[in-house]
Amino acid sequence: SIPWNLERITPARYRADEYQPPKGGSLVEVYLLDTSIQSDHREIEGRVMVTDFESVPEEDGTRFHRQASKCDSHGTHLAGVVSGRDAGVAKGAGLRSLRVLNCQGKGTVSGTLIGLEFIRKSQLVQPVGPLVVLLPLAGGYSRVFNAACQRLARAGVVLVTAAGNFRDDACLYSPASAPEVITVGATNAQDQPVTLGTLGTNFGRCVDLFAPGEDIIGASSDCSTCFVSRSGTSQAAAHVAGIAAMMLSAEPELTLAELRQRLIHFSAKDVINEAWFPEDQRVLTPNLVAALPPSTHRAGWQLFCRTVWSAHSGPTRMATAVARCAQDEELLSCSSFSRSGKRRGERIEAQGGKRVCRAHNAFGGEGVYAIARCCLLPQVNCSVHTAPPAGASMGTRVHCHQQGHVLTGCSSHWEVEDLGTHKPPVLRPRGQPNQCVGHREASIHASCCHAPGLECKVKEHGIPAPQEQVIVACEDGWTLTGCSPLPGTSHVLGAYAVDNTCVVRSRDVSTTGSTSKEAVAAVAICCRSRHLVQASQELQ
Amino acid sequence: QEDEDGDYEELVLALRSEEDGLADAPEHGATATFHRCAKDPWRLPGTYVVVLKEETHRSQSERTARRLQAQAARRGYLTKILHVFHHLLPGFLVKMSGDLLELALKLPHVDYIEEDSSVFAQ
């Protein structure tokens, strides 16, 4: 009678063999910044160290009575979810607790910052193995909170946080909005986003993935062997902190970028009922539910990629949106999306020595998103090859001409306000995989990369009749690095990658009066690294 | 997950030191910004995190904090330095009147100041 949440994050291979996941996480220290905790609860006794750190505001109300079991309830439950003997995810992980929330579950940004600094200082004084910091709390967007999280992440610490329980865009909250933090939304046993009273889990592009967060069994501070069921994005974040501890115990040298990519890779895909989210947030919200890897094997041989959406550009004519990859990731392609279809494309630019993806709004447009495809590829070296608008009927073309460089993505950008008034190009002739083709009025940008053993292929799926959505997926063993539409006509809203599938969206053609000549194709670039495959075979 | 999300109030004050002479003035044309939580009930006015520029030397945090206290005292304001940050961000946490924000934003090395706000268990 395993609790539903532990079953959900356990891969089918474990369940089929009636295999208990290893008591993993033993090489990892998890810091919990929360309420006080009942450290002698049997679930966590002996595996929790209560630090002397405490930075909490006074409780509200003159008649507030501090009751130990109430003061400890939130933190005790989460400690149990992370590493509880019976109902924990990472049963071997050690825990250190810092009290930053008072008996009413309230704290301050400043108190939490001092807590994060305490962790950094501890790390400098006595460096240990991998560290995971669990922040099961949320406040309004805070520049300083996000900056502190960024610094701690860059010092090699994995930060995991709750997306928030406000049924709102997680980007409006901190630390959920910090790019370096792994932000976790909550789902229930039916894979529905969790409803909490009139509110529920936060969503949007600042959420990295979801995890079980409703009716989660965990240690109760009511007694030393009591359990209680609680719900919230804190519980979801605790699951991911536990999974992270397991992964880091198996591969202690994993970087934050590698860990995040693995969390995404091993998640259950497309199981969440997206109808729960506001319509404009569905495309931005990852449809991923966290799970443990099928075994503690090293997954280093895979080419991992993820999709990063920018903030919305806003509607002004010259507005742009920028999507960035994490520090150790490489931007392999760049695309854009606009709900109105009014956009002027996208391109890869250098910014502070790193490649970024910039999308451009068009006159009369409601704004655009830039979409970066961010990948982990050792010893990669990329450059962008650009062709100016050709003006010729065949359209603009550009290819990767450097020796050993392969095409990982195509972007197009145009200055004209509406490509729809210009004749679209014919489809790219086949047999030229290292080539990007676009509208004759657009400049075309090819992302060309070199890495040991990197090979890529172009996969196209065209539909002769107008369609709201065209998709093309990469086969097993191949990873989607690039996704773009062909041709770049006005009714194309944009292209983006969802897991290993390239999605090209068009306007509802029945309302635009478009003719069937305006067919659309999705072009996927699928890559793999023979070098990584060989390395993994040598490991085994 | 970006640092440039909307719904976040930002008050930019152009800096020009008048009373305190050039020693207190920042580099020409520099601006420090003030931030506070967009969700009003969560604001905690009276406590501020003063964040210094990234390249600021460790010792500068204490020095800037003392400087703020001295200048505030000259104006008849009491301030209390609650914490000095060294290991994550250069800066300090100060309890002071909001009247002193303009003064604090004019201090050398200041990148931005953020009003404290509440966080909640989720």
Epitope: A87, D222, C223, T225 | -
Partner: antibody
């Protein structure tokens, strides 16, 4: 050797009260919680409450709040159960039991029979 | 409030046979469940703690298993002195201590 010895049972009039004692020996008295459990004739076990001799903290089954009071005298290594407003249904064998680290009852007294009858 | 349901209420077996008693909790209790033996006219005696650990001095023929909500007490080969009433017990918040209704193991 750990020992718990109850005393104070007997015949009580309905509406009356009585005080049971539990004398502990053979271990550090203040380290272990002591619980009172009763068993009506031919019935199962029913928990009344507990005391932490270290700090005197008590906890009761809601059913017995206001009816039972648990106390201790550390100088005598003795626990007490005061029962008020006794009725016929309070007739039972009353046991004191030591809670090992608060989770299982590793040592029990021999029990003392309380009969409530007119 | 957690309810512990023991089954069967009575078990009629002969010496040397295997006895299996189950205890089902109405809520998740992890592995924090204890088993006691009570003979007529005596106080209960702790047999198994934390679902599967034998208490001091308990013979190896007694074993416990299970976690979560379903637990089993097994006596591999009944001895004459094993005929008694067996209770399961957990800690909860209100009331803090809960006992099962008991299972009587009698001689067939």
């Amino acid at each position: 050797e750990v020992q718990l010895l109850e005393s104070g049972g007997g015949l009580v009039q309905p509406g009356g009260s009585l005080r049971l004692s539990c004398k502990a020996s053979g271990y550090t008295f203040s380290r272990y919680g002591i619980n009172w459990v009763r068993q009506a004739p031919g019935k199962g076990l029913e928990w009344i409450g507990r005391i932490d001799p270290g700090n005197g903290g008590t906890r009761y089954n809601e059913k017995f709040k206001g009816k039972a009071t648990i106390s201790r005298d550390n100088s005598k290594n003795t626990l007490y159960l005061q029962m008020n407003s006794l009725r016929a249904e309070d007739t039972a064998v009353y046991y004191c039991a030591r809670a090992n680290d608060g989770y299982s009852f590793d040592y029990w007294g021999q029990g003392t029979l309380v009969t409530v009858s007119s | 409030e957690i309810v512990l349901t023991q089954s069967p209420a009575t078990l009629s077996l002969s010496p040397g046979e295997r006895a299996t008693i189950t205890c089902r909790a109405s809520q998740y209790v992890g592995s924090y469940l204890n088993w006691y033996q009570q003979k007529p006219g005596q106080a209960p005696r702790l047999l198994i703690y934390d679902a599967s650990n034998r208490a001091t001095g308990i013979p190896a023929r007694f074993s416990g298993s299970g976690s979560g909500t379903d637990f089993t007490l097994t006596i591999s080969s009944l001895e004459p002195e094993d005929f008694a009433v067996y209770y399961c017990q957990v800690w909860d918040s209100s009331p803090p201590v809960v006992f099962g209704g008991g299972t009587k193991v009698e001689i067939k």
